[in-house]
Amino acid sequence: HSFGPGPGLGTPRSPCNARGPCRLFFRVCLKPGVSQEATESLCALGAALSTSVPVYTEHPGESAAALPLPDGLVRVPFRDAWPGTFSLVIETWREQLGEHAGGPAWNLLARVVGRRRLAAGGPWARDVQRTGTWELHFSYRARCEPPAVGAACARLCRSRSAPSRCGPGLRPCTPFPDECEAPSVCRPGCSPEHGYCEEPDECRCLEGWTGPLCTVPVSTSSCLNSRVPGPASTGCLLPGPGPCDGNPCANGGSCSETSGSFECACPRGFYGLRCEVSGVTCADGPCFNGGLCVGGEDPDSAYVCHCPPGFQGSNCEKRVDRCSLQPCQNGGLCLDLGHALRCRCRAGFAGPRCEHDLDDCAGRACANGGTCVEGGGSRRCSCALGFGGRDCRERADPCASRPCAHGGRCYAHFSGLVCACAPGYMGVRCEFAVRPDGADAVPAAPRGLRQADPQRFLAGVIAVIVVVVIAIVAGIVVLVISRKKRMAKYEKAEIKEMGEMHRELNA
């Protein structure tokens, strides 16, 4: 087995990221073949972590193509019958070592997932999986622990009747001590350790054992079948077994002799010289979550899964939290409904991603009668007299800028300000000088003119104030009515949208 950069992926990169020595571990996880989200469900069939891991230290310019890997086997014990079809998850983990790494640090380098078919008792099946820039070569097989036997590791054990001990002549099952060995159905004397049977009165040998009762290791076997006894020192003359002796075809393949050699006819889902390789095709449905399987028409060609929205991974086994990408703009609320993404928009925004700014001024942006002015993709408030700030929420002193001309006195008022003009001047800001003898007012002239009739002046001021107040009230009324209409329109739309969302969530 090997783990490293895939072919044609540029300079092989180190798994240690130039941060000192590291070690690689493998976590193997087995799940039932129907598991729909392979990385999210439990490892129901079993899980194991590799041991005896050599330390890898990166040297400048050194190729990472051949990394020292955990030696020996990763054994995943499974308690129940072997299902034949299963999901295999292999995770490659890096443990960063050394002080400058800040103590041991674990990182998941790669995860491969795939549905597999494998009968127990067969030879090693080889596989190659790519994920990102990494490539993992590995072999796997399933073996039954006695007394379980056959392609499905069926138990030839039954539940014990008495809690304390097994019946006469029967012993506890291993590895199932809570059960007792079943009454013998195999050929009497058939080795319980190295032989098994699927039919009564037969004795089939596990790998490495032979003889009528499976008691003879293959290496020291006495001369069997057509093998001719030889001199005592040599034990046997071995002209070679018949090509189909012992059935070299694994996984239920049938052997036929062809010109001194053999040929295996493999059952569906297996291929290779001895039917030892488990091939998954698109017809096996290897892609989870409705993913589209492309390629893989035959077991020799690799398949690729094209995932539905919201899923990723080599077999579409991982759910993506699409809301983490913050797809809803302008403060919209994101709801991932599985195969649909919904954004609930704030007032004033619409569209699948809340990208449409319906009306910058929709959300009562300007307070205290201020008017919202759009422009250049942004909004600003033109505030009513007496108010200021971004949203017109701050009280302003209207007299601070000394708005009354010609010595007029400024008084702050609920609608803004009022100027009490000095003798000889009139107007909202005391900008007009008053002509003698009731002539029309003119813009301010040099001083020395006669003072106007105070009563007429006061009437002018009141008239101006009334006009201003009426204008402001009318403006507010128009603004409130138009806003109410707009809000009613979007409340309807939002109620409809929430109804749709509720339906989808219920679905």
Partner: antibody, heavy 117, light 107 residues
């Protein structure tokens, strides 16, 4: 070779019922989402509904136009998916196809349903 | 539901012609668009998935392009067996929806 074969179509009166079947071969049926898609005469394609896997509790989804009237079920042991159609309307007249997956990769040959008085 | 608008609804072309069919989505569907071919009396067949990827066994004269809301199916050199109706479908948002179809006829 992958094959999906629909059956059960025919002529039915408005308000009547019909049960369509789709038998699959050449695929590991239990690993596939199954859909029904229909096509009214001279019209385009319309997705009708979907059933997912045993591990997903055989979850079903339906188009708004058939919700409450149509029911999809499956029998993995028989490699078959069903479409039970109740309260049929004239607008349900169409050729009904069964398809696999999310992207409708494999299709059956279709079965014709005619709703007419 | 997302609407898919296909154009033209029909077109006449000769063998060897370059044919382009367009499909417009009512909202952004990324690249989750597939194209299907349907011959009279037959079931649809998947041609293109993911907007631009040819499905297994589909000839190289078929190509797809586009993303977001505008998509195109192109047949670089029309062959006699290509006369059929073509449908686009979006798979971005559930439920999947299809365009009205484009019938490619012999001129």
């Amino acid at each position: 070779e992958v094959q999906l074969v629909e059956s059960g179509g025919g002529l039915v009166k408005p308000g009547g019922s019909l049960r369509l079947s789709c038998a699959a071969s050449g695929i590991t049926f239990s690993n596939f989402w199954m859909n029904w898609v229909r096509q009214a005469p001279g019209k385009g394609l319309e997705w009708v509904g979907q059933i997912r896997l045993k591990s997903e509790d055989y979850a079903t989804h339906y188009a708004e136009s058939v919700k409450g009237r149509f029911t999809i079920s499956r029998e993995d042991s028989k490699n078959t998916v069903y479409l039970q159609m109740n309260s049929l309307k004239t607008e349900d007249t169409a050729v009904y196809y069964c398809t696999t997956g999310y992207y409708f990769d494999y299709w059956g040959q279709g079965t014709t349903v005619t709703v007419s008085s | 539901n997302i609407q898919m608008t296909q154009s033209p609804s029909s077109l006449s072309a000769s063998v060897g012609d370059r044919v382009t069919i367009t499909c417009k989505a009512s909202e952004n569907v990324g690249t989750y668009v597939s194209w299907y071919q349907q011959k009279p009396g037959k079931s649809p067949k998947l041609l293109i998935y993911g907007a631009s990827n040819r499905y297994t066994g589909v000839p190289s004269r078929f190509s797809g392009s586009g993303s977001g809301t505008d998509f195109t199916l192109t047949i670089s050199s029309l062959q006699p067996e290509d006369f059929a109706t073509y449908y686009c479908g979006q798979f971005y948002s559930f439920p999947s929806t299809f365009g009205g179809g484009t019938k490619v006829e012999i001129k």
